[in-house]
């Protein structure tokens, strides 16, 4: 069964800056990746970035840089300043879509005891959905 992992890290150099990394563990081609915060993509969360493997990347503040790391993983840097900045308990979700086969989504947040710059290993989060 395909799975999605989400890793959230606070940058040591900028304490209000977050890096979100997400990956897809499974076979099949990814047609779109959506990163959101405040909850899953279709359930009240706000979209931060959308990445298409061929057609490009779209992002919205406070997203600063979204990019593909591999064919099945992405990273997103968030710039935290002002009212729209993330906080330590913000939930970030990543949805990997493979149209029309299905979509898989997982969410994660900053580990409670994590020091800036340190991060937990990427583990699949249990909020998975296949359409």
């Amino acid at each position: 069964t395909p799975e999605v992992w989400v890793q959230v890290r606070m940058e040591a150099t900028e304490l209000s800056s977050f890096t979100i990394r997400c990956g897809f563990l499974g076979s099949g081609s990814i047609s779109l990746v959506t990163v959101s915060w405040g909850g899953p993509n279709g359930a009240g969360g706000t979209t931060l970035a959308v990445l298409h493997p061929e057609r490009g990347i779209r992002q919205w503040a406070p997203a600063r840089q979204a990019r593909w790391e591999t064919q099945s993983s992405i990273s997103l840097i968030l710039e935290g300043s002002g009212a729209s900045s993330p906080c330590a308990n913000t939930t970030f979700c990543c949805k990997f879509a493979s149209f029309p086969e299905g979509s898989w989504e997982a969410c994660g947040s900053l580990p409670p005891s994590s020091d800036p710059g340190l991060s937990a290993p990427p583990t699949p989060a249990p909020i998975l959905r296949a359409d």
């Epitope: 047609s31 969360g45 057609r55």
Partner: nanobody, 120 residues
Framework: QVQLVESGGGSVQAGGSLRLSCAAS????????MGWFRQAPGKEREGVAH???????RYVESVKGRFTISQDHAKNTLYLQMNSLKPEDSATYYC??????????????WGQGTQVTVSS
């Protein structure tokens, strides 16, 4: 979770008409297009038509003048009126909600699909 439910598919003779409907339960934030894709066995998946957030409809060349896409915002429903159907229009038609990349509507959520069969 976004729910898209298509209806209106079926079998029809060449030259006939069908009207597909898609009821949407909610939208993902910032999505800015809604439309129809189709896929026939052994063929490339194809974006048939979509409507931008500004209400402008766009069509693939092969259906221009025959298909009309429209929206009923009050009912959260998308339609595809298909006239002068041809056997090559036979496919599974998917309703999609997605994000615009140029003139392309990249599917973020989609329905289960409805089958359209056009016989000669």
């Amino acid at each position: 979770q976004v729910q898209l439910v298509e209806s209106g598919g079926g079998s029809v003779q060449a030259g006939g008409s069908l009207r597909l409907s898609c009821a949407a339960s909610r939208y993902t934030s910032r999505t800015d297009c809604m439309g129809w894709f189709r896929q026939a066995p052994g063929k490339e998946r194809e974006g048939v038509a979509h409507i931008d957030s500004d209400g402008i409809p766009r069509y693939v060349e092969s259906v221009k003048g025959r298909f009309t896409i429209s929206q009923d915002h009050a009912k959260n429903t998308l339609y595809l009126q298909m006239n002068s159907l041809k056997p090559e229009d036979s496919a599974t038609y998917y309703c999609v909600v997605g994000f615009k990349f140029g003139d392309y509507c990249a599917p973020n959520d989609w329905g289960q699909g409805t089958q359209v069969t056009v016989s000669s």
